[in-house]
Amino acid sequence: SPIMNLEQSPLEEDMSLFGDVFSEQDGVDFNTLLQSMKDEFLKTLNLSDIPTQDSAKVDPPEYMLELYNKFATDRTSMPSANIIRSFKNEDLFSQPVSFNGLRKYPLLFNVSIPHHEEVIMAELRLYTLVQRDRMIYDGVDRKITIFEVLESKGDNEGERNMLVLVSGEIYGTNSEWETFDVTDAIRRWQKSGSSTHQLEVHIESKHDEAEDASSGRLEIDTSAQNKHNPLLIVFSDDQSSDKERKEELNEMISHEQLPELDNLGLDSFSSGPGEEALLQMRSNIIYDSTARIRRNAKGNYCKRTPLYIDFKEIGWDSWIIAPPGYEAYECRGVCNYPLAEHLTPTKHAIIQALVHLKNSQKASKACCVPTKLEPISILYLDKGVVTYKFKYEGMAVSECGCR
């Protein structure tokens, strides 16, 4: 159990963040640490707690699993939006109403899209059930209209006032999924205060005749316990992203100097040889002078090491549908002065490492931590909504550094 190994890992000096936590706080156990990590993780997902339902009972829409698998297996393809949510029809009691060749299907969706997200696209997926005489080659030709049902206030209590979202024709030869663009309505819903919204689907014969069994039937599958329940798929993007400026850091690295090197006549090189050569010269001097650092530097300098996270192992398979686990990596090792350029040290880390070198009692070493994180794709439950994130940021270490 890879992540559980942390509990038993030897608490060597500067081995890892966990080592520091355990050595400095004797009372902390692994479960407490795991809980605090979980809380932080949930906070970033805007979740207050892990959904209580067991993943075994959650039957995500096939479409969402197909989406996840498509982008997980084909790394060259990208979805049209970073976040994809699926909302299922919540109206499990209303029956379709048939009248003069017109069949009406009321649909109800609990849709909640955060205001900071931009809705790129939304589609209503309906499974059409086609019944026709197999001896007749023709398919079933029907007119379909999808309405947004408005909240009625005042004059028309009880009336269903509706706006036309989509109007078109379906020519059905086989039962299959049909997709309709309802982006305008979902953008409207996002702006509105309420989360419960209604659509209504009308299917009617094209030529004013009552539906005739001989010409076949076309219906929408709205059965609750069914894989074919109407689905609302909302594609959105998170608009908030921050990028750090690095000019000051680079400047600090270029000015990095050991006071002990002053009397060795190395000052004159600061504007002479390149940065790498200077780093190498300083490194040689330090390695020669400090056996302990030389020993550590061989195999235990700050670097990325494998760490596979199994969601089942940490109890998160109850809300993370896919993947079952992933390679997160971790940063292990020591940050000794001088801090190499590839470890992209901060000004503070450089100073702290220097102070530690002079007086180990006064300051601890800089920490070996992730400095660049990569996203992973996840399919998870958010308040009962099956949600896919193509890029769930900050999940896997791509680079380690000293901080």
């Epitope: 209209t145 309405f147 947004e148 408005l150 909240e151 009625s152 206030k153 005042g154 004059d155 028309n156 009336e159 269903r160 006032n161 509706m162 706006l163 036309v164 979202l165 109007s167 305008d184 953008r187 409207r188 702006k191 509105s192 205060g193 009308h202």
Partner: antibody
Framework: QVQLQESGPDLVQPSQTLDITCTVS????????VHWVRQPPGKGLEWMGT???????DYNSAFKDRLAISRDTSKNQVSLKMDSLQTDDTAKYFC?????????WGQGILVTVSS | QFALIQSDSMSTSAGSTVKLSCKRS????????VYWYQQHEGRSPTTMIY?????PDGVPDRFSGSIDSSSNSAFLTINDVQIEDEAVYFC??????????FGGGTKLTVL
């Protein structure tokens, strides 16, 4: 194709009743909604009321006591009836189709209220 | 009941950019849906913008709509103004109370 055509009198006596019909083609009144909007000469647009696809009707409260909107789906017609007309009711009266937004208008009928 | 306030007239030169405003007197402009209509002299209106910032098919992308909650206003921006853009522009608000309110209209003159 989609069309809306207003018909009715050009001239109405003060205190009399205005009766205008909007005949539509190319769409169904049980699918689309119809607005009535008027525009006095040289002035702005004023929403009067809406005949909803579900059969509901909304009125501008400024007209509610004297305005009645109805429809006959078999004839594809929406009617507007307004009584107690005054000279300031002189305007061009439009019907317009509301789908997700107003996408088609009639050409309007100019009604003059004068004795 | 609120009102939608538009300036009576504006003039601009061909090729320039103009921004027409529509201020909601009370209540929040963001709580309703804003439409913009163009009406040429003697003609029926046509919808240029719906839901504040959506363009119906056939409307040139020179026309764009926006909402500014700080000024409680909606805006219709016309880039690269053409002679044929000379018309009266009306804003309209539609809220979930199923009520439609028009602004007084802005007459745009293209010099």
């Amino acid at each position: 194709q989609v069309q809306l055509q207003e018909s009715g009198p050009d001239l109405v006596q003060p205190s009399q009743t205005l009766d205008i019909t909007c005949t539509v083609s190319g769409f169904s009144l049980t699918t689309y909604n119809v607005h009535w909007v008027r525009q006095p000469p040289g002035k702005g647009l004023e929403w009067m009321g809406t005949m909803w696809n579900g059969g509901g009707i909304d009125y501008n409260s400024a007209f509610k006591d004297r305005l009645a909107i109805s429809r006959d789906t078999s004839k594809n017609q929406v009617s507007l009836k307004m009584d107690s007309l005054q000279t300031d009711d002189t305007a061009k009266y439009f019907c317009a189709r509301l789908g997700y937004y107003v996408d088609y208008w009639g050409q309007g009928i100019l009604v003059t209220v004068s004795s | 009941q609120f009102a939608l306030i538009q300036s009576d007239s504006m003039s601009t030169s061909a090729g320039s950019t103009v921004k027409l405003s529509c201020k909601r007197s009370t209540g929040n402009i963001g709580s309703s849906y804003v439409y913009w209509y163009q009406q040429h002299e003697g003609r029926s209106p046509t919808t240029m913008i719906y839901d504040g910032d959506k363009r119906p098919d056939g409307v040139p992308d020179r026309f764009s709509g926006s909402i500014d909650s700080s000024s409680n206003s909606a805006f219709l921006t016309i880039n690269d103004v053409q002679i044929e853009d000379e018309a009266v522009y009306f804003c309209q608000s539609f809220s979930s109370g199923i009520k439609f309110i028009f602004g007084g209209g802005t007459k745009l003159t293209v010099l």
